[in-house]
Amino acid sequence: GITIPRNPGCPNSEDKNFPRTVMVNLNIHNRNTNTNPKRSSDYYNRSTSPWNLHRNEDPERYPSVIWEAKCRHLGCINADGNVDYHMNSVPIQQEILVLRREPPHCPNSFRLEKILVSVGCTCVTPIVHHVA
Amino acid sequence: GITIPRNPGCPNSEDKNFPRTVMVNLNIHNRNTNTNPKRSSDYYNRSTSPWNLHRNEDPERYPSVIWEAKCRHLGCINADGNVDYHMNSVPIQQEILVLRREPPHCPNSFRLEKILVSVGCTCVTPIVHHVA
């Protein structure tokens, strides 16, 4: 759709790569000011498909630290607190935007990158393949 | 920590806002080339805490269109296929980076922004508060 007329205060866009190369202000604005930081911090333990969080660090990436979920069990926790292997714990994966320094080790030049992260786990009914 | 020495081929950084304003190439690089695109597409239906995706549009954001998860039930689906309200379906939320046009309506100038998105749902044991 059409957006409002271009703001006359916009930076110059005569770059030959425009609009593929853009200016980005890294002072992150957080729109989640009224959210509770402990919001889902205990779901990893209380879930029927519990998970652990693992630290992933990469100094050439922004953000440099990302926490990744790994399901604790192949099955899911039943009402008795035991692992039920008739159900499956699976990671919910998401592709997220990060900035990758490009050229490498440059402090002020980045490229957008999509990386796949596991955010948590959910319990699903398995797909059963019947052999004829 | 200490980063690798600066690459001599880096773009000029004499901007008065450096290093807060950087150049970003929007030609997204995907590091997940060997993954199966159908990987998690049916978990939303097979989960004991199923979810639907809802469309959210914002032309001042990049990406402009985001489909977000909303849990279908308060409870979780039991072995009989019924909703068990002794358990809770809860959204797994994550903060992700997006780009916000700044100044508004500029095609080539952005600010990094963190937004909270619900990625999927998981089934958790409820926290029971006993009244004295």
Epitope: T3 | N27, N30, S40, L53, E57, Y62, W67
Partner: antibody, heavy 132, light 110 residues
Framework: EVQLLESGGGLVQPGGSLRLSCAAS????????MLWVRQAPGKGLEWVSV????????HYADSVKGRFTISRDNSKNTLYLQMNSLRAEDTAVYYC?????????????????????????WGQGTTVTVSS | QSELTQPPSVSGAPGQRVTISCSGD????????VSWYQQLPGTAPKLLID???QRPSGVPDRFSGSKSGTSASLAISGPQSEDEADYYC???????????FGGGTKLTVL
């Protein structure tokens, strides 16, 4: 060449059912949200439904909610519209259209996000006539 | 509102500038992007103006779009006979969780 080809229209009695198909070619179907739009004889365009890239998200116009079901098979590059309990007022030419290359938080996708978007590809339409 | 508001018809000579208005509210035009579609008689609609006022390849530069508040407009500078068609605006509506179209405007080239 990017193309959408609808089929499945025809004459049906009130209360009957029809299933429309839309075969996509020339683009990566699984990256895009897809829509159905209809046009009654001598009338304007009316949006019917939209589906997210993985199929996990759907929205419907109030006029068809509970009667029509949108779905997709990304392995076959095909979009569907199952129409039940058809009424005389459903008589129209039905078009499928390609929407935004959008971001789904709970599934992986493989394109860059559309910098500009809209229903940029339309099929030729298939006619549905509901009459006794 | 379930439909965006457009004038039923407009007309203009090849030397004139013709504008088609599209009025909505804060849940559609006021917040989200507006796109414009051209439908020639007996054919499927075609995207004419996309977000950020972009014209898909093949759309002549005599077509342009703008938006202010809850209203958008399509301008045709020097309409040609081949531009005689129905024109529709559309936007995503947050309240309805769906796309809303305008009622359509028939352009007659004098």
């Amino acid at each position: 060449e990017v193309q959408l080809l609808e089929s499945g229209g025809g004459l049906v009695q009130p209360g009957g059912s029809l299933r429309l198909s839309c075969a996509a070619s020339g683009f990566t179907f699984s990256h895009y949200e897809m829509l159905w739009v209809r046009q009654a004889p001598g009338k304007g365009l009316e949006w019917v439904s939209v589906i997210s890239p993985s199929g996990g998200g759907t929205h419907y116009a109030d006029s068809v909610k509970g009667r029509f079901t949108i779905s997709r098979d990304n392995s076959k590059n095909t979009l569907y519209l199952q129409m039940n309990s058809l009424r005389a007022e459903d008589t129209a030419v039905y078009y499928c259209a390609r929407g935004s290359e959008s971001f789904e938080v709970s599934s992986s996708w493989y394109g860059g996000w559309d910098y500009y978007y809209g229903m940029d590809v339309w099929g030729q339409g298939t006619t549905v006539t509901v009459s006794s | 509102q379930s439909e965006l508001t457009q004038p039923p018809s407009v007309s203009g000579a090849p030397g004139q500038r013709v504008t088609i208005s599209c009025s909505g509210d804060t849940s559609n035009v006021g917040k989200n992007a507006v796109s414009w579609y051209q439908q020639l008689p007996g054919t499927a609609p075609k995207l004419l103006i996309d977000s950020n006022n972009q014209r898909p390849s093949g759309v002549p530069d005599r077509f342009s779009g703008s938006k202010s508040g809850t209203s958008a407009s399509l301008a045709i500078s020097g309409p040609q006979s081949e531009d005689e068609a129905d024109y529709y605006c559309a936007a995503w509506d947050d309240s309805l969780s769906g796309v809303v179209f305008g009622g359509g405007t028939k352009l007659t080239v004098l």
